[in-house]
């Protein structure tokens, strides 16, 4: 699987999850988030060669098409597969509010 | 929606579904498929600027991060959203077999 366990331990040029730390205030301008100050959102990148973690029959077909037609511009792209939520703390007035934001952290990637 | 209705009628540079005809025999080497000879598989391509059909909170966050950090390599990618099956006819010996292959045709795209 193209997950953090594999990708963070290997120098992988092809589609894999990459570490990306986002600071809420500096990188997003979200000054209202109290905790955490930032988090590892991660991202997916790298080429999708033939059969690399193909998501659907279409991505398999497109990968094969690309192999047999190397000049083609149509190819699968490396995108998030498994995402996890992130729990944040912020204030509504003086009232603390804990909220879980869904799909915030990329744990693995796929070629789609 | 970034679907065939919209994308095929507009000269859209950003993420959209693009027409791609695949000939089973010539482009894939699938000589065994009797009918159809080929089909419009289509594909997704084009940049994913901030908030363009963002798929998840993560892709929204990544798009915003990219806007505020233009030099960053992390950005959402244009990939299939809705896929449709394709019905094919092939022969097992002399027995005709009609089969529906799932997720063969891209109908719309998203930024993921």
């Amino acid at each position: 699987a193209l997950d953090t366990n594999y990708c963070f331990r290997n120098l992988e040029e092809n589609c894999c999850v990459r570490p990306l730390y986002i600071d809420f205030r500096q990188d997003l301008g979200w000054k209202w988030v109290h905790e955490p100050k930032g988090y590892y959102a991660n991202f997916c990148s790298g080429p999708c060669p033939y059969l690399r973690s193909a998501d659907t029959t279409h991505s398999t077909v497109l990968g094969l098409y690309n192999t047999l037609n190397p000049e083609a511009s149509a190819s699968p792209c490396c995108v998030p597969q498994d995402l996890e939520p992130l729990t944040i703390l912020y204030y509504v007035g003086r009232t603390p509010k804990v909220e879980q934001l869904s799909n915030m952290v990329v744990k693995s990637c796929k070629c789609s | 929606a970034l679907d065939t209705n919209y994308c095929f009628r507009n000269l859209e540079e950003n993420c959209c579904v693009r027409p791609l005809y695949i000939d089973f025999r010539q482009d894939l080497g699938w000589k065994w498929v009797h009918e159809p000879k080929g089909y419009y598989a289509n594909f997704c391509s084009g940049p994913c600027p901030y908030l363009r059909s963002a798929d998840t909170t993560h892709s929204t966050v990544l798009g915003l991060y990219n806007t505020l950090n233009p030099e960053a390599s992390a950005s959402p990618c244009c990939v299939p959203q809705d896929l449709e099956p394709l019905t094919i006819l092939y022969y097992v010996g002399r027995t005709p077999k009609v089969e529906q292959l799932s997720n063969m045709v891209v109908k719309s795209c998203k930024c993921s």
Partner: antibody, heavy 121, light 111 residues
Framework: EVQLVQSAAEVKKPGASVKVSCKTS????????MNWVQQAPGKGLDWMGQ????????NYNEMFEGRVTLTVDTSTSTAYMELSSLRAEDAAVYYC??????????????WGQGTLVTAST | DIVLTQTPASLAVSLGQRATISCRAS??????????MHWYQQKSGQPPKLLIY???NLESGVPARFSGSGSRTDFTLTIDPVEADDAATYYC?????????FGAGTKRNDA
Amino acid sequence: EVQLVQSAAEVKKPGASVKVSCKTSGYSFTTYWMNWVQQAPGKGLDWMGQIFPASGSTNYNEMFEGRVTLTVDTSTSTAYMELSSLRAEDAAVYYCARGDGNYALDAMDYWGQGTLVTAST
Amino acid sequence: DIVLTQTPASLAVSLGQRATISCRASESVDSYGNSFMHWYQQKSGQPPKLLIYLASNLESGVPARFSGSGSRTDFTLTIDPVEADDAATYYCQQNNEDPLTFGAGTKRNDA
């Protein structure tokens, strides 16, 4: 160079299941049908079924009474054959073999080395 | 199912001589202008190896000593001249009808 490398020999009890793998290399895995063939000791060849890796489409020989399941993992270019409810008469060498590519049912141009399955108490 | 009957079941031929193996199908295996009959060689402890496809076409890398002929229900594999390395069991296979079937095999021994 086209290669089909099968998993090691297995000893199973009657009633159990066995899953044999066939790892391929040297060709486009999603372009050709993959066949499975049984050869009982000192006997001839029996075609069990086939799978098309790109779509997962399958065709089975009724002789195996729905006990055979063929699957693939395209990310590793590996085909699998699972035989359930093993009987003593299932003791055999099992081969994966690539179809020639012109038809679904076809001549088989490349074969794995075979996996011996023994069903014994 | 199409039954393929191979004769003889075993064959002893002297080196340098001609060996002929017959395969008879219970019904025609011809369609679309092709004869869907193929021949394989299997040596002891090895997987089968494709020799002849579509009745008469020599598979790449197979010596020209091997040839195939026939149509409809009657097919022949010929080895001429026979060499010591040809000691093996030979199988015919049809794919004109589902299920794909093999003959019972012909074992070639040294005379």
